[in-house]
């Protein structure tokens, strides 16, 4: 038995920040779980982890180079990524594991979310603005 994960197909980070919501076919309330976000087609780089435990506060871990926070819903975990760089544009996959209560469960691999990080391009003000309208 596998947990199903739904993610937006694509998100654009205009201000170098993005909210990626991972929606699960499973209620995480009163469960011990580990939700993680993986970068790349092969999911090689784990960039953020949210650990939840019925008896303690949610714990969030960010890999160096990623500024991450996490928020828990009943059937979702939202990863808030900030200070993203253009070269961090990639596909990101949500993963979930539930350890307690038994049985251990994890997810079917999702389709992932392409996060497109747009660089900040400041437009210079024109040297000769046109005549102002009355």
């Amino acid at each position: 038995n596998k947990i199903l994960v739904k993610q937006s197909p694509m998100l654009v980070a205009y201000d170098n920040a993005v909210n990626l919501s991972c929606k699960y076919s499973y209620n995480l309330f009163s469960r011990e779980f580990r939700a993680s976000l993986h970068k790349g087609l092969d999911s090689a780089v784990e960039v953020c982890v949210v650990y939840g435990n019925y008896s303690q506060q949610l714990q969030v871990y960010s890999k160096t180079g990623f500024n991450c926070d996490g928020k828990l819903g009943n059937e979702s975990v939202t990863f808030y990524l900030q200070n993203l760089y253009v070269n961090q544009t990639d596909i990101y996959f949500c993963k979930i594991e539930v350890m307690y209560p038994p049985p251990y469960l994890d997810n079917e691999k999702s389709n992932g979310t392409i996060i497109h990080v747009k660089g900040k391009h400041l437009c210079p003000s024109p040297l000769f603005p046109g005549p102002s309208k009355p």
Partner: nanobody, 124 residues
Framework: EVQLVESGGGEVQPGGSLRLSCAAS????????MGWFRQAPGKEREFVAA????????DYAESVKGRFTISRDNAKNTVYLQMSSLRAEDTAVYYC?????????????????WGQGTLVTVKP
């Protein structure tokens, strides 16, 4: 809840070697990391080395690179720290830590559980 038990500390002469072990028990996920930190008398606990479960990520403090090697036996849920070319400044209590992060974190705050520590003394 994760329990950590360290062993292998002791007294050794400068230039000598020691191998520390840290056995973890409790509920484990598919990826996590374990690391070694040390604390000398009157000093802060400092990062030494760390390795993740998948063994595809390891990190070392600059002061131990080339002298210490971290490894792990996943079947035994045990992490090892092979220490060679030991110096007087390596004298400290060595602590094993566990984090749910899946990378070899050098950040002390990332570690959720700690062992009781094992003393390493390097003196002539």
């Amino acid at each position: 809840e994760v329990q950590l038990v360290e062993s292998g500390g002791g007294e050794v002469q400068p230039g000598g070697s020691l191998r520390l072990s840290c056995a973890a028990s409790g509920r484990m996920f598919s990826n996590y990391a374990m690391g070694w930190f040390r604390q000398a008398p009157g000093k802060e606990r400092e990062f030494v080395a760390a390795i993740n479960y998948r063994r595809d990520d390891a990190d070392y403090a600059e002061s131990v690179k080339g002298r210490f090697t971290i490894s792990r036996d996943n079947a035994k849920n045990t992490v090892y720290l092979q220490m060679s070319s030991l110096r007087a400044e390596d004298t400290a209590v060595y602590y094993c830590g566990f984090t749910y992060a899946g990378w070899a974190s050098s950040r002390r705050d990332d570690y959720d559980y700690w062992g009781q520590g094992t003393l390493v003394t390097v003196k002539p």
